[in-house]
């Protein structure tokens, strides 16, 4: 059956032979209606990439550099299955490219000029492409030929396989630049030995190199890693201090109509029958015909790449930056230590309009990028299409798991001038009901619920976390009869109450009328039994404070709070009747952009913050008529975090634990991708 066939692309006679064997052995173990293999032979991996894009083949396994080529237009391929190494219990699908130095040296990443460098080899990922790609814009001009620029940047190097005649400085630490193990400083172990012997000041290797060469922890403690933010960390902190995370070997397919489920079904069955130590007659991860045919011989199996993970996310911002710099050879005109405009991520058109107004008023220091969901915005910040946005705590958690960092906190209670330096305790997550109802915390089953959005703190993580510990399952759509929780599956009962309009029904952005704090409260007013919001929501939308038709006549006394002990209290008493304390919303950014974002925002709030009194004729950063666009409308200022500069420290142990527990109920495709 052609639609059940996966056309595998082979790049040599030997690969084609193994592919045919793969096809025949899979036929013998799979049912006739199951997936099958067909083999397509091409001259090179690049030809395979083009064939897949043209729908002449379906899959091929590629190294990281080729995954980058496959992702570029017009190919637009995506990673669908990753090879893993190590054990099934602790599968490794990536390695980390690191810069190792001796502990007793005192320079940082931005002080490498004039040092001596040790590389694994010319054109190799961890030893050359990544470090030189990331340093590219610091290299002296002209940057072509690249080897000459590198030779002039470092005071001496060992770059195995370089041309020692044309570029003698690249071979200064290893005469001749031998391209095999005859050169004692060749490859990973060699580059590390070059550092260890004192020949070089820095070695560009992979994270495992130091562990493979120094079994003793005391010996390893004599070394450190250089981080991109110009700090250092111990060698075991490579996940937080590396030049790039590099995928090892990946199966790619078309982004649209790519048969990824079929490819996974095929490879999953293949590893069951012909994986490591499974079969004598055919082995997926070895071959009598040659090395690394179709798959790496060192692979132990396959893992499905999460569907939300596109090539940009898979390769990572640092890796793409390095490779793009090397390939395109372009550098910003501005010096790299100067802050470029900050690209703010705006959700849908309401936020985009406010962001545009901010952009005009900031004289272009703020630029705007749009996405339809918060998760899409976080992904854009991860891959460099955007730089920053302000997030509810639930999304600060997801952003943190995806490598972003909190930069500034929204403060709601501290008057100026102390606001900028004050760390507030947070706000209260509350459950609001109509005073006329007889609801309590204990009889919510079967009622109609209103949520700010799935994944947000007051509207979801806190109430659903509490509910989960009571009902011990994730079927919240069965607990409530119906509701509006923007971001739920469209056919879920938790979208039934949403107002839309139609194509935007239940979307987690302002196009859905019941989105956010004000939207969830409106849902309660018009349709629901209980709304999960922040403690300020009722006062901010009653007594004529919200002029919208649905809100202008509402009275605060018509609403009450549900307390966890089964009682109810006035909305004026959130301190004695709340579900939990929630961390304030916070601005997040990539680590490399955090300082610029902080500096710019502090400057912007001095001009457009709460000190502006007339928002009808001046731009106000924290104003959008109860819509909480870009920032919460009740923000007094953006405050420095001081030492609360990681998502764990910012959110606090208790909240992180609560959200981690709720992860078993997670519907976040981005979180799944970021924890892959």
């Amino acid at each position: 059956v052609p639609e059940k066939s996966v056309r595998w692309c082979a790049v040599s006679e030997h690969e084609a032979t193994k592919c045919q064997s793969f096809r025949d052995h899979m036929k013998s173990v799979l049912p006739s209606n199951g997936p099958s293999v067909a083999c397509v032979k091409k001259a090179s991996h690049l030809d395979c990439i083009r064939a897949i894009a043209a729908n002449e083949a379906d899959a091929v396994t590629l190294d990281a550099g080729l995954v980058y080529d496959a992702y570029l237009a017009p190919n637009n391929l995506k990673p669908v299955v990753a090879e893993f190494y190590g054990s099934k219990e602790d599968p490794q699908t990536f390695y980390y490219a690191v810069a190792v130095v001796k502990k007793d040296s005192d320079f940082q990443m931005n002080q490498l000029r004039g040092r001596k460098s040790c590389h694994t080899g010319l054109g190799r990922s961890a030893g050359w492409n990544i470090p030189i790609g990331l340093l590219y814009c610091d290299l002296p001009e002209p940057r072509k030929p690249l080897e000459k620029a590198v030779a002039n940047f470092f005071s001496g190097s060992c770059v195995p396989c370089a041309d020692g005649t044309d570029f003698p400085q690249l071979c200064q630490l290893c005469p001749g630049c031998g391209c095999s193990t005859l050169n004692q400083y060749f490859s990973y172990s060699g580059a590390f030995k070059c550092l260890k012997d004192g020949a070089g000041d820095v070695a560009f290797v992979k994270h495992s190199t130091i562990f493979e060469n120094l079994a003793n922890k005391a010996d390893r403690d004599q070394y450190e890693l250089l981080c991109l933010d110009n700090t250092r960390k111990s060698v075991d902190e490579y996940k937080d201090c590396h030049l790039a995370r590099v995928p090892s070997h990946t199966v790619v397919a078309r982004s649209v109509g790519g048969k990824e489920d079929l490819i996974w079904e095929l490879l999953n069955q293949a590893q069951e029958h012909f994986g490591k130590d499974k079969s004598k007659e055919f082995q997926l991860f070895s071959s009598p015909h040659g090395k690394d045919l179709l798959f790496k011989d060192s692979a132990h199996g396959f893992l499905k790449v999460p569907p939300r993970m596109d090539a940009k996310m898979y390769l990572g911002y640092e890796y793409i930056t390095a490779i793009r710099n090397l390939r395109e050879g372009t550098c910003p005109e501005a010096p790299t230590d100067e802050c470029k405009p900050v690209k703010w991520c705006a959700l849908s058109h309401h936020e985009r309009l406010k962001c545009d107004e901010w952009s005009v008023n900031s004289a272009g220091k703020i630029e705007c990028e749009s996405a339809e969901t918060t998760e899409d915005c976080i992904a854009k910040i991860m891959n460099g299409e955007a730089d920053a946005m302000s997030l509810d705590g639930g999304f600060v958690y997801i952003a943190g798991m995806c490598g972003l960092v909190p930069v500034l906190a929204e403060n709601y209670n501290t008057p100026n001038p102390n606001c900028e330096n004050t760390a507030e305790e947070g706000y209260f997550a509350v459950a609001v009901v109509k005073s006329s109802s007889d609801l309590t915390w204990d009889n919510l089953k079967g009622k109609k619920s209103c949520h700010t959005a799935v994944g947000r703190t007051a509207g979801w993580n806190i109430p659903m976390g509490l509910l989960y510990s009571k009902i011990n399952h994730c079927r919240f759509d069965e607990f409530f009869s119906e509701g509006c929780a923007p971001g739920s599956e469209k056919n879920s009962s938790l979208c039934k109450l949403c107002m839309g309009p139609s194509p935007n029904l239940c979307e987690p952005n302002n196009k859905e009328g019941y989105y956010g704090y004000t939207g969830a409260f409106r849902c309660l007013v018009e349709k629901g039994d209980v709304a999960f919001v922040k403690h300020q929501t009722v006062p901010q939308n009653t007594g004529g404070k919200n002029p919208d038709a649905w809100a202008k006549n509402l009275k605060e006394e018509d609403y009450e709070l549900l307390c966890l002990d089964g009682s109810r209290k006035s909305v004026q008493e959130p301190a004695n009747c709340h579900l939990a304390r929630a961390p304030n919303h916070a601005v997040v950014a990539r680590k490399d952009k955090a300082d610029c974002v902080q500096t710019l925002l502090l400057d912007q709030q001095r001009m457009f913050g709460s000190s502006v009194t007339d928002c009808s004729s001046n731009f106000c950063l924290f104003e959008s008529k109860t819509k909480d666009l870009l920032f919460r409308d009740d923000t007094v200022c953006l405050a420095k975090l001081h030492d609360r500069n990681t998502y764990e420290k910012y959110l606090g142990e208790e909240y992180v634990k609560a959200v981690t527990n709720l992860r078993k109920c997670s519907t976040s495709p981005l979180l799944e991708a970021c924890t892959f």
Epitope: E357, N361, S617, E623
Partner: nanobody, 117 residues
Framework: QVKLEESGGGLVQPGGSLRLSCAAS????????MAWYRQAPGKQRELVAG???????NYRDSVKGRFTISRDNAKNTMYLQMNSLKPEDTAVYYC???????????WGQGTQVTVSS
Amino acid sequence: QVKLEESGGGLVQPGGSLRLSCAASGSIFSIATMAWYRQAPGKQRELVAGITRSGSTNYRDSVKGRFTISRDNAKNTMYLQMNSLKPEDTAVYYCTDYSSRYYHDYWGQGTQVTVSS
């Protein structure tokens, strides 16, 4: 709500010029920021240029040096002078103000600009 009406569009050859006007009914002096947007067929609406109450301006990169935004508060009018027009400037041009702070997606009829030889 301030009502805005765009005019001045038309068909022009590459390299030519046009001046768009945006007339406001009601006083625009109190409006903080005004802007011109454009939308080409099948594309998202995009900010072209904006002007604050104090007269400071901002332009999208592709029009810098070619377009000039201005406003005349006495006449309740905002302008967009477009020089060295290119085929890629072809779009419907809209003016907007952000005075309501609601940031609703309300737009007028716009004025069609076509750059073609």
